[in-house]
């Protein structure tokens, strides 16, 4: 996260990190006990989900194996469309005050609302700073129309993007796959953005989450 | 295979503008920055400036701001110079490279792995 | 604007001698962002080493890179026929600045 500040303590419990090992790889999204909503650029063979701590390597966090990702069949490398995907734990997510299921969107939020985007990703572009605590950093959603004049053709339909004029903040490497929230419901997923990160007015991409809700449950029900 | 190839050879005449465009092939055009760099007969590699495709933001050289103008196409994956008002000091053999990432996205921090990727240089010549 | 400064201009060698070509920068640079080329007459310059000491794909090995901070240098560690050319190191932060060139020529 670029220009942001840590999370107030406790405030994003759905957030949760996916781990290489004990490295960062990308954010996500609790969706309930057993599923994981993160970028389908993500993918990887196994995960370590760590979920219910602010803190990356706090010991009372749990961390929970995962072997299983679905990724949204239209999903492209080139353009980054349709960037998103499911990851099955291996276990049961224990919900508590620290860990909390997300709320999934039931409509699509205006331009011009005011959003939180939150991960461990690097708070510095090129040259990279992990923080061990979780950061935010407030955005406004952008017009498709008003984006396309940056992006011009990169810009597909099921994108979403989001920043404030003139300004740094954003997200980065390491954030892909973590939640934008929007009057606490979940509109985007981090998915890309210009490099070096923190560019002002060029916005940060997000896939567009009330565009796949349908997918989202009809997966998590075929894989049971 | 990842290649760039740009327009033919160039005659202009002193204070005209020459357009050179450089298409790439076999690898996201938005993925990377696009540089130019140029090299007068017999000297070296001098850097005029480069263009982030996403963006389309531009960083030029101090020596060229104000006469040179870099542009994008990424519906036919085409990066162009400009370069106005020519002077026969001008005259080289014009290159555009790809350089490093112009877009994030993942986990892992980006290494600078080099420009990996030449034009095949346009001469571009300035003589009245 | 970091200046980069190549000694020496020229250097006269036989094949299978080894070569060592300087890189001075006027500040200190991230050796993330150094990279070396070659250039052969009527040619593009080609990649040879970028992150001071990493090679390009198809590079071969008597070629390598070391350095930090100012200094950098480019080792061949035996010459072949077809390594005679100019070297150029670069940096880029994220602006490009190129060094002079070393001219690498037969005895």
């Known amino acids: 996260i670029i220009d942001g500040a840590p999370c107030a303590r406790g405030s994003h419990p759905w957030q949760v990190a996916l781990l290489s090992g004990n490295q960062l790889h990308c954010g996500g999204v609790l969706v309930n006990e057993r599923w994981v909503l993160t970028a389908a650029h993500c993918k990887m063979n196994e995960y370590t989900v760590h979920l219910g701590s602010d803190t990356l390597g706090d010991r009372r966090a749990q961390r929970i194996k995962a072997s299983k990702s679905f990724r949204h069949p239209g999903y492209s490398t080139q353009t980054h469309v349709n960037d998103l995907m499911l990851v099955k734990l291996n276990s049961q997510a224990r919900l508590s005050s620290m860990v909390k299921k997300v709320r999934l969107p039931s409509r699509c939020e205006p331009p011009g609302t005011t959003c939180t985007v939150s991960g461990w990703g690097t708070t510095t572009s090129p040259d990279v700073t992990f923080p061990s605590d979780l950061m935010c950093v407030d955005v406004k959603l952008i017009s498709p129309q008003d984006c396309t004049k940056v992006y011009k053709d990169l810009l597909e339909n099921s994108m979403l993007c989001a920043g404030i004029p003139d300004s740094k903040k954003n997200a980065c490497n390491g954030d892909s796959g973590g939640p934008l929230v929007c009057r606490g419901t979940l509109q985007g997923l981090v998915s890309w953005g210009t490099f070096p990160c923190g560019q002002p007015n060029d916005p940060g991409v997000y896939t567009q989450v009330c565009k796949f809700t349908k997918w989202i449950n009809d997966t998590m029900k075929k894989h049971r | 295979q990842v290649q760039l190839v740009q327009s033919g050879a160039e005659v202009k005449k002193p204070g005209a503008s020459v357009k050179v465009s450089c298409k790439a092939s076999?690898?996201?055009?938005?993925?990377?920055?696009m540089h130019w760099v140029r090299q007068a007969p017999g000297q070296g590699l001098e850097w005029m400036g480069s263009?982030?495709?996403?963006?389309?933001?531009?960083n030029y050289a101090q020596k060229f701001q104000g006469r040179v103008t870099m542009t994008r196409d990424t519906s036919i994956s085409t990066a162009y110079m400009e370069l106005s008002r020519l002077r026969s000091d001008d005259t080289a053999v014009y290159y555009c490279?790809?350089?490093?990432?112009?877009?994030?996205?993942?986990?892992?921090?980006?290494?600078?792995?080099?420009?990996?990727?030449w034009g095949q240089g346009t001469t571009v010549t300035v003589s009245s | 604007e970091i200046v980069l400064t190549q000694s020496p201009g020229t250097l006269s060698l036989s094949p299978g001698e080894r070569a060592t070509l300087s890189c001075r920068a006027s500040?200190?640079?991230?050796?993330?962002?150094l990279a070396w080329y070659q250039q052969k007459p009527g040619q593009a310059p080609r990649l040879l080493i970028y992150?001071?000491?990493s090679r390009a794909t198809g590079i071969p090995d008597r070629f390598s890179g070391s350095g930090s901070g100012t200094d950098f240098t480019l080792t061949i560690s035996r010459l072949e026929p077809e390594d005679f050319a100019v070297y150029y190191c670069?940096?880029?932060?994220?602006?490009?600045?190129f060094g002079g060139g070393t001219k690498v020529e037969i005895k």
């Open positions: 670069q940096q880029y932060a994220p602006l490009w600045t």
């Open positions: 263009i982030n495709p996403t963006s389309g933001r531009t």
């Open positions: 076999g690898y996201t055009f938005a993925g990377y920055d």
């Open positions: 500040q200190s640079v991230s050796s993330d962002y």
């Open positions: 490279a790809r350089g490093g990432p112009s877009t994030w996205y993942g986990g892992s921090a980006y290494t600078y792995y080099g420009a990996d990727v």
């Open positions: 992150g001071a000491s």
